[in-house]
């Protein structure tokens, strides 16, 4: 099919465009080149005749178009007016005619733009701005850029008039950038020139440096004030309301205690007609003062507060020494020193960060220290604990139990007997105690600062008789060469003595064997197989003596390394194989079976009814203990003979 | 306002010759193609032949090819159709008609009113 | 040359009608080269419509045209008194250009 291609689409006014004709026919009388999108003879180009090769201009020739024998068509130096369509009429050798359309744009070579602004010297928080791209040029994109970046998306930028303006509303000091516009078209791409945004701003509220109030007397007093602004802001100085000097320094030699007083720092712009003041106390000592310590928090809460601690005063050119427990500060995570070390930060207090805390100022000669300092961490309370510790008492005699909670505030104490209030006291006594007296007895702390409290609950028995004794044990299975068993005969009774026997024997002596807690607790290290016994607790006082019930000790062991019988190896064709594997193990192990690496069954016994000698090779069982985690095995070669065919050979089973 | 009107109507004797001339106004006449079509009496449309507006190149039908002679006179806004050794079969309205295209098109945008050749003896 | 064959030769309708004229060409033609005539006895003929489809300027929007090929379509969506005339088709794809015999359309 004939087609027309353009080269190029888009063309730049003054420059040139091939109209590139693809497909044509062969056997052709000529062709006519026409303007638009049809035949139109008002509207022809040029017409070329094949046979004598005449081009003839038709009414819209303007002397810049070129026709080839291809029947493309070259226009030069291309003017606006050329965009559009055009139409190749194709007369062929039969006086067929044949015709295609193609067509392309024409743009100006774009002028390099500038920007236009409505508003040279915008204020802060109160002007907008309008940058305008120049020239408006037709078929054009408007593009901006900010400090070589694309626009950022702001709700105070706003694009208009087809991108040409860009307006930022209510400007601030951080619109202060350069500013580019682009202009491009699809044959050329031009930026502007910088512009720079001058934002008129401020006085902000000036800063007095440097921010130390103390001086000495003697020194020189430099104060310089600074106040963000744009054009850069007037400064004045007034010491106690009296106007002292237009500068943004202030310098004072040698000054004495009568320099002491307000200063301040007033700044003014003189484009946005704002004044800003700033005031700061200055103190002059006629010698260096003693340093004391202040605190943010005088009563931290452990694990809770941060306690920030100041040495004052503040002093220009002055060295801050801190010292805990008179000692110097140590290497801590929880401790911070500011950059002028004048500000100690204890982050998330504990009870241990009492102190006490000193600090120092050094002058030339010496160190002024502070006087200390003591913090009152709240803390607590902690569970209390109830002492004595028994549980038995026999009756008549007196039962005095005494409660304490670590606390700051020191804890207020309260007694319950069987969850009935008994008295608000630390301490509580009974005289010539009797069965009645026997029950749950509670304490229970109170922190009034931090509204926390905190009990511990003890039973209590009053009897003549002994109770009966009862072992307990810290690890009821414990593993072969590994674990240590801890028994303890309960309960703890007042005036006992407390025996023990091992499968109905006194204890034997053993390294492994100790006795601890008034012979209360008997631990095993190292358990072994062994130690699987019955082990029995006693207790006796003068009057009574009782036994416990006998707790075995159930130790996990093995797998061992399993045996497989029979012990034949030799067997002769048509036997039964029944081989069974063992292994002494606690609890028992799983038994599997493999035959030549093949995994078989999950049993104890393999059994293979009349062997042959496709079944010589190796039987290997593997033993595993899930409780103790440990694995076995052993291997065993079997043959099969043929029948017959060597003597001494089991039958099987 | 495209106008084309046609003269040189008249009755001729078989074998001899007239001259149709079609003078045209309100385009650029030189600019385009021109043809002639004609009509036999109770028949259809039936073209004739064509020239072109800026290069001399002519189209005939194969019922007039070598009889009838087409030309025109750019200078002059006319359009001539010689036609020798005439036929009884040529007898019809003759009608002039403009081409859109400036090579011969084949497509008629404008046309006149017709004139009418007798050939009869 | 390519054969045009119109039909029917004669339409009677009445005006408000729908009136639709057929042409078929002996081979295929491209739609860009097929033109449709209106010709009225003692006047001259009238371009309506080109490229198969494409109104000639001044004509009415109840005339249009269709088809593709070898077959293409003249409608008259709803007939006027000055539609009844004879309507041709024509190509002027290759030479000679041919018209068809004519659609005769008269008022019933």
């Known amino acids: 099919k004939l087609t027309i291609e353009s080269t190029p689409f888009n063309v730049a006014e003054g420059k040139e465009v091939l109209l590139l004709v693809h497909n044509l026919p062969q056997h052709l009388f000529g062709y006519s080149w026409y303007k638009g999108e049809r035949v139109d003879g008002n509207r022809q180009i040029i017409g070329y005749v094949i046979g004598t090769q005449q081009a003839t201009p038709g009414p819209a020739y303007s002397g810049r178009e070129i026709i080839y024998p291809n029947a493309s068509l070259l226009i030069q130096n291309i003017i606006q007016n050329d965009t559009g369509f055009y139409t190749l009429h194709v007369i062929k050798s039969d006086l067929v005619n044949e015709e295609a359309t193609g067509q392309f744009r024409v743009y100006p070579e774009l002028p390099k733009p500038s920007i236009s602004s409505n508003n040279s010297k915008p204020v802060e928080d109160k002007d907008a701005v309008a940058f305008t791209c120049e020239p408006e040029t037709q078929d054009a994109t408007y593009l901006w850029w900010v400090n070589n970046q694309s626009l950022p998306v702001s709700p105070r930028l706003q694009l208009s008039n087809g991108n040409r303006t860009l307006t930022l509303f209510n400007v601030t000091r951080n619109d202060t950038a350069s500013y580019k516009c682009e202009t491009q078209n699809p044959v050329s791409a031009r930026r502007s020139d910088s512009v720079i945004l001058n934002v008129l701003y401020g006085p902000d509220a000036p800063t007095i440096s440097p921010l130390n109030t103390s001086y000495r007397s003697g020194e020189n007093l430099n104060l310089s004030c600074h106040a963000a602004s744009n054009p850069p802001a007037q400064y004045s100085w007034f010491v106690n309301g009296t106007f002292q000097q237009s500068t943004q320094e202030l310098f004072i030699p040698n000054i004495t205690v009568n320099n002491s007083g307000s200063y301040t720092c007033q700044a003014h712009n003189s484009d946005t007609g704002l004044n800003r003041t700033t005031v700061t106390t200055i103190t002059v000592y006629a010698e260096p003062p003693k340093p004391f310590i202040t605190s943010n928090n005088s009563n931290p809460v452990e694990d809770e507060d941060a306690v920030a601690l100041t040495c004052e005063p503040e002093i220009q050119n002055t060295t801050y020494l801190w010292w805990v427990n008179n000692q110097s500060l140590p290497v801590s995570p929880r401790l911070q020193l500011s950059n002028d070390n004048r500000t100690l930060t204890l982050l998330s207090v504990t009870r241990n960060d009492v102190g006490p805390y000193e600090c120092g100022i050094q002058n030339e000669l010496s160190v002024d220290h502070s006087d200390p300092v003591i913090l009152n961490v709240l803390y607590g309370p902690d569970d209390p604990t109830i002492s004595p510790s028994y549980t038995y008492y026999r009756p008549g005699v007196n039962l005095s139990l005494s409660c304490h909670a670590a606390s700051n505030p020191p804890a207020q104490y309260s007694w319950l007997i069987d969850g009935n209030i008994q008295q608000h006291t630390q301490e509580l006594f009974i005289s010539n105690i009797t069965e009645k007296n026997s029950g749950l007895y509670t304490c229970q702390a109170n922190n009034s600062a931090s509204g926390h409290s905190r009990t511990t609950v003890k039973t209590i028995t009053v009897s003549a008789e002994l109770p009966k004794p009862s072992i307990s044990s810290n690890n009821s299975k414990p593993v072969e060469d590994k674990d240590a068993v801890a028994f303890t005969c309960e309960p703890e009774a007042q005036n006992t003595t407390y025996l023990w026997w091992v499968n109905g024997q006194s204890l034997p002596v053993s390294p492994r064997l100790q006795l601890s807690n008034g012979n209360r607790t008997l631990t095993l290290f190292n358990v072994t197989r062994n130690d699987a016994r019955a082990y029995v607790c006693g207790i006796q006082n003068s009057v009574s003596a009782n036994r416990s019930d006998p707790v075995t000790l159930d130790v996990l062991y093995g797998p061992d390394t399993p045996i497989i019988s029979p012990p034949d190896s030799s067997y002769l064709s048509g036997a039964n194989l029944n081989l069974s594997c063992h292994s002494a193990s606690n609890p028992s192990p799983q038994y599997s079976w493999r035959i030549n690496g093949i995994p078989q069954q999950h049993t104890q016994v393999l059994f293979i009814a009349k062997i042959t000698p496709n079944n010589n090779g190796t039987y290997a069982c593997f033993v595993s203990n899930l409780a103790t985690g440990r694995n076995n095995s052993i291997v065993k070669s079997i043959t099969v003979s043929a029948s017959g065919t060597s003597p001494g050979l089991s039958a099987g089973a | 306002e495209v106008q084309l009107v046609e003269s040189g109507a008249g009755l001729v004797q078989p074998g001899g010759s007239l001259r149709l001339s079609c003078a045209a106004s309100?385009?650029?006449?030189?600019?385009?193609?021109m043809t002639w079509v004609r009509q036999a009496p109770g028949k259809g449309l039936e073209w004739v032949s064509a020239i072109s507006g800026s290069v001399d190149i002519t189209y005939y039908a194969d019922s007039v090819k070598g009889r009838f002679t087409i030309s025109r006179d750019n200078s002059k806004n006319t359009l001539y159709l010689q036609m020798n050794s005439l036929r009884a079969e040529d007898t019809a309205v003759y009608y002039c008609?403009?081409?859109?295209?400036?090579?011969?098109?084949?497509?008629?945008?404008?046309w006149g009113q017709g004139t009418l050749v007798t050939v009869s003896s | 040359e390519i054969v045009l064959t119109q039909s029917p030769g004669t339409l009677s309708l009445s005006p408000g009608e729908r009136a639709t004229l057929s042409c078929r060409a002996s081979q295929s033609i491209s739609s860009i080269y097929l033109a449709w005539y209106q010709h009225k006895p003692g006047q001259a003929p009238m371009l309506l419509i080109y490229g198969a489809s494409s109104r000639a300027t001044g004509i009415p929007d109840r005339f249009s045209g269709s088809g593709s090929g070898t077959d293409f379509t003249l409608t008259i969506s709803r007939l006027e008194p000055e539609d009844f005339a004879v309507y041709y088709c024509?190509?002027?794809?290759?030479?000679?250009?041919?018209f068809g015999q004519g659609t005769k359309l008269e008022i019933k």
């Open positions: 024509q190509q002027f794809g290759s030479s000679p250009w041919t």
């Open positions: 309100g385009f650029t006449f030189s600019s385009y193609a």
């Open positions: 008609a403009k081409d859109r295209g400036n090579w011969n098109y084949g497509l008629f945008d404008y």
